[in-house]
Amino acid sequence: QRLPRMQEDSPLGGGSSGEDDPLGEEDLPSEEDSPREEDPPGEEDLPGEEDLPGEEDLPEVKPKSEEEGSLKLEDLPTVEAPGDPQEPQNNAHRDKEGDDQSHWRYGGDPPWPRVSPACAGRFQSPVDIRPQLAAFCPALRPLELLGFQLPPLPELRLRNNGHSVQLTLPPGLEMALGPGREYRALQLHLHWGAAGRPGSEHTVEGHRFPAEIHVVHLSTAFARVDEALGRPGGLAVLAAFLEEGPEENSAYEQLLSRLEEIAEEGSETQVPGLDISALLPSDFSRYFQYEGSLTTPPCAQGVIWTVFNQTVMLSAKQLHTLSDTLWGPGDSRLQLNFRATQPLNGRVIEASFPAGVDSSPRAAEPVQLNSCLAAGD
């Protein structure tokens, strides 16, 4: 039985600078004036962040079609980035003995690159997605998912690992990014914010969504995760944004209804198998794709990220349950568990659909096979 704990006035931070928050953050002291306890003391030696527009600059966006009930990312308005203050790089702390499983956390010391050097790599995740700059790649075919509809038995393990809520998946969930690009799902987990503060990891034109689901996959070319880590395409993650909608999402409720049982850090429970594909958007044909990294230590690169264009709708109550039920390290609420967006450093995000209108047409020139030309270059 868990002892009651006092709710934090200022929950453990992760990735959000305050500039990126929609409402109610004006009273927070600026980092320069009075750094919050969880903020890093200095990040001069770390890679900088992309300049992001403040969320309050974005008008409210309505779903495109009533039948679908889901926002499409290309519906978001294009906003010029005004050069906001950089978001802090999230940090982690590692056991002094240097255990093979590092003990890290969001918003603490030392910086993640000290936990895992790969976290200072040039091609990290998450990133800000700017549809206008995405390269339309007709070769990106609809994703194929097989075996994602699981029977109730055997049950699946749902765990509060102190960083997220994670559902371990059985073998047999097959996913193809395209011909010869086959993967099997390992686990899924979520990232979220706090009351009135969004917590997705990826952003779109600087807009941060309430939450984000990640389904982590291992390439069938590798038998073990440790062999695949850091290898191009060794791991692939399907990511979808979670948004507030008018109705309860019955698929998510199968997990969210069990969170109270795993409120304590490290606790776990068994849940009946469910349709994992129902946790994802229905449109597998429209997505963004780029090569990045794991968003937590070990931050291994070579990860193929596929971010759905369509979002998933959860009720306000469900989003509140997600962000307000679990506890993390040090008797702090498990909230704002997202990493700051990382610089693209020359990477081009590809889109499986024409995500942006090219306002500056270019002369036709030879293009290498299997390559896509970034719009607006």
Partner: antibody, heavy 122, light 107 residues
Framework: QVQLQESGPGLVKPSETLSLTCTVS????????WSWIRQPPGKGLEWIGY???????NYNPSLKSRVTISVDTSKNQFSLKLSSVTAADTAVYYC????????????????WGQGTLVTVSS | DIQMTQSPSSVSASVGDRVTITCRAS??????LTWYQQKPGKAPKLLIY???SLQSGVPSRFSGSGSGTDFTLTISSLQPEDFATYYC?????????FGQGTRLEIK
Amino acid sequence: QVQLQESGPGLVKPSETLSLTCTVSGGSISSYYWSWIRQPPGKGLEWIGYIYYSGSTNYNPSLKSRVTISVDTSKNQFSLKLSSVTAADTAVYYCARRGYDILTGYDYFDYWGQGTLVTVSS
Amino acid sequence: DIQMTQSPSSVSASVGDRVTITCRASQGISIWLTWYQQKPGKAPKLLIYAASSLQSGVPSRFSGSGSGTDFTLTISSLQPEDFATYYCQQANSFPITFGQGTRLEIK
């Protein structure tokens, strides 16, 4: 190299409480699950329960009413208390680390103590 | 609770032999099965986890397979140090349970 060492009395009287401590060296107790497992002489292994470094516990229902596992992160130790013991609790008691791969969710007992024999007898 | 049943209870073999030990779960456990080796007076040693993943440092002559309810541990060519008792353990649901053990003896 992580090492685990059980300590405690080798003889406990019936109806009393068995108390054992496991000291972890060569690594931090943080970020892992720490278990107690026992093995009656000449028999198989029985999982007693685990504790996460933060204090979260999970016990075998067959022993739950009698078991308490606690952790002291400052000393890098975790402990087992088993109340109202009988001769059936005579066993070699092992402490073990339940490793957990955060990427895959796989878990396993990867480090074990050498075990300590506890005899319940008057 | 999930019952784990190993067979055979004991097996005699010679150095160089190929030996297979089976483990059956009373209900499906996906691939959440672990194999351990225990020598007299010693603690168990992790061999295989997630049904088929070889623990670091364990010789490649050990292999595991299976999914659902039926699993096997195979030693491709027995070495003198392999004579021991082998246990399977399910990690799918709580309580964690072990098989009764298979004793591998020298013929």
